[in-house]
Interface confidence: low
C-alpha cells in the first residue's frame, strides 16, 4: 500500500485583517493511526496552532467533521486574522506511539500573508513659520500595513512634488510595516491658501488611496510691506498721515507711531481686510497738529508682526518757514517728504 502523503494544495493564501483564513490539508490514507496537528513555522521554534487530539483553540475550527469515519480532510479555518498571524503553516501527521505520539509526515506548508490597511496618513509641518522663498519640511506617517509594498506621493495644490525621501520600516520581515516620508517645499507669497497632500496607495485600498493634508497657512509667514502717506486735510493746522500695512500673514500685528522717536500711539490690528491670496491689509492713521511743532517732524510707523523683529518706515513732515514764524496763524499746508526707512 502507498505510504500516506500530507497534501497542502495551496503554497500561499492571502487574507485581509479581520477575515478568516482557510488552510487546506488532506491525507491520502487513514494509516498510520494518529492525530494531526497544525503548526506555524518549522523546527524548534514552531508554534502549535491546532491539535486534533487535545487542547482548546478558540480561533480555530475544522472545515470537516474530523471524527467522521474515513475522513481525510484536515483543513482548518482561523478566525479574526491579524498581521501577527502571518507565517508558514504546516499540517503534520503523527503516528500513535507510547508514551508520546511520533511525528510521521509534514505537509509542504502554506504561507499565510495578511493584508492590513495602512492607518490614515498624518501630515505634520514645521514647528516654526518660514517666509516666502524659504524651504520647509513636511512629514507624512502611516502605520500597520501589510504587505510591505506601498506607494507614497506628495502634491502641492494638485501638482506632484519630487523633492521627498521615504522610508518603510522595518527593513526586514515583519508582521506589519510603517512608512515615513519627508517632503521639502519652497514657499511662495501666494501660499497662504496652499495645501500639501500626502497620498498613499496600497493593495488593501483597492485603488482608493488614503490622503493626509496640511495647510501651508500653518507654515508660512508673509511679512508686511509699509507705506506712509499724507492725506489731504480741510483744517489748515492739521496733517493726517496714514500707514498702509499690506499683504501680511498671519493676522497678529501691533503698530506703533513715533513722533521724533517718541511713542505717540500703539494699537493692535483688529479690523483687517483679507486679500484674495489670504494675506491681510490694514491701515492706521495719525493726526498731527502742525501748530504744535516749530521744527520738521519725523513720523515713524513701526510694525511688529507675528512676534518678529519690528519693521518701520519713517517720513519727514516738513513745517514751512512761514508756519515756524507765525506759529498757529499759518495757513499753508505742511509738506510731507519721504525719507529712507530707519
Amino acid at each position: 500500500e502507498d505510504e500516506l502523503q500530507v497534501i497542502q494544495p495551496e503554497k500561499s493564501v492571502s487574507v485581509a485583517a479581520g477575515e478568516s483564513a482557510t488552510l487546506r490539508c488532506a491525507m491520502t490514507s487513514l494509516i498510520p493511526v494518529g492525530p494531526i496537528m497544525w503548526f506555524r513555522g518549522a523546527g524548534a521554534g514552531r508554534e502549535l496552532i491546532y491539535n486534533q487530539k487535545e487542547g482548546h483553540f478558540p480561533r480555530v475550527t475544522t472545515v470537516s467533521e474530523l471524527t467522521k469515519r474515513n475522513n481525510l480532510d484536515f483543513s482548518i479555518s482561523i478566525s479574526n486574522i491579524t498581521p501577527a498571524d502571518a507565517g508558514t503553516y504546516y499540517c503534520v501527521k503523527f503516528r500513535k506511539g507510547s508514551p508520546d505520539d511520533v511525528e510521521f509526515k509534514s505537509g509542504a506548508g502554506t504561507e499565510l500573508s495578511v493584508r492590513a490597511k495602512p492607518s490614515a496618513p498624518v501630515v505634520s509641518g514645521p514647528a516654526v513659520r518660514a517666509t516666502p522663498e524659504h524651504t520647509v519640511s513636511f512629514t507624512c506617517e502611516s502605520h500597520g500595513f501589510s504587505p510591505r509594498d506601498i506607494t507614497l506621493k506628495w502634491f502641492k495644490n494638485g501638482n506632484e512634488l519630487s523633492d521627498f525621501q521615504t522610508n518603510v520600516d522595518p527593513a526586514g520581515d515583519s508582521v506589519s510595516y510603517s512608512i515615513h516620508s519627508t517632503a521639502r517645499v519652497v514657499l511662495t507669497r501666494g501660499d497662504v491658501h496652499s495645501q500639501v497632500i500626502c497620498e498613499i496607495a496600497h493593495i488593501t485600498l483597492q485603488g482608493d488611496p488614503l490622503r493626509g493634508t496640511a495647510n501651508l497657512s500653518e507654515a508660512i509667514r508673509v511679512p508686511p510691506t509699509l507705506e506712509v502717506t499724507q492725506q489731504p486735510m480741510r483744517a489748515e493746522n492739521q496733517a493726517n498721515v496714514t500707514c498702509q500695512v499690506s499683504n501680511f500673514y498671519p493676522r497678529g500685528l501691533q503698530l506703533t507711531w513715533l513722533e521724533n522717536g517718541n511713542v505717540s500711539r500703539t494699537e493692535t490690528a483688529s479690523t483687517l481686510i483679507e486679500n484674495k491670496d489670504g494675506t491681510y491689509n490694514w491701515m492706521s492713521w495719525l493726526l498731527v497738529n502742525t501748530c504744535a511743532h516749530r521744527d520738521d517732524v519725523v513720523l515713524t510707523c513701526q510694525v511688529e508682526h507675528d512676534g518678529q523683529q519690528a519693521v518701520s518706515k519713517s517720513y519727514a513732515l516738513e513745517i514751512s518757514a512761514h508756519q515756524k514764524e507765525h506759529g498757529s496763524d499759518i495757513t499753508h499746508e505742511a509738506a510731507l517728504a519721504p525719507t529712507a526707512p530707519l
Partner: antibody, heavy 119, light 107 residues
Amino acid sequence: QVQLVQSGAEVKKPGASVKVSCKASGYTFTSNAMHWVRQVPGQGLEWMGWIKAGNGEIKYSQKFQGRVTITRDTSATTAYMELSSLRSEDTAVYYCARGDYYYYYMDVWGKGTTVTVSS
Amino acid sequence: DIQVTQSPSSLSASVGDRVTITCRASQSISDFLNWYQQKPGKAPKLLIHAASSLQNGVPSRFSGSGSGTDFSLTINSLQPEDFATYYCQQSYSTPLSFGGGTKVEIK
C-alpha cells in the same frame, strides 16, 4: 556593529542564585531570540533555554526547568538569565547568543560570564 | 529528545589537509543543523547554518552537507587558525542539543 555584552564573573555559595545580564546593541533587539548556553570547564556546550525578544515567549530545557528564569527588558535591549539553587556542578561559563527565528542558529555570542559555585 | 552524536571526538591533522567531521541525529531533522567553531577561552563562532549555508565572513574552505539524520562538516586545506573544537547543533526541536564536539589538533 552587532554585539552582546555580558555582566562580569560571579562567585556564589551553594543554594544561592545568580543573575547574568546580556546587553544587545547594533540590531533590532525584538527581531531575534536570545539563547542561553553554558559550558562546564572541559566539557561541551549545553543549551539552557531561549526567549523570543519580540513577544516574550520562553522555552526552557527540561534539565533546568524550575531553576532557570529567562527574562528580557526591551527598552534596555537586555536579556537576563537567573539560575537558582546553585550547586557546585553549576560552575561554568554562561553564554548568551542571538538566535535566528527560523533555523534557531546562534550567530552572535557574548564573551561569556564565569560563574563559580563554591562553599 | 533528539540526540546528536558527533564523530570523531578528536583528530590530528596537518596544515593543508582535508578534514571531515560527521554528525548524526537520533531522528530526521531535515536541514535544521548548524556548525560552530570554538577556540580555548573564547565563545563559539557560527560557521554553517541550515546544514549547508556558509555564515557571512566564514572562509569558503568550510562547507557543510547532509539532510535528515546524517551531516558533515568539511574543511578543505586546513589552516593554522582552524585548529579548534567543532560542535554541531540541531534546532529541529527543543531542547536544542549540541554534539559532544570534535577537537582538531596539530599532527
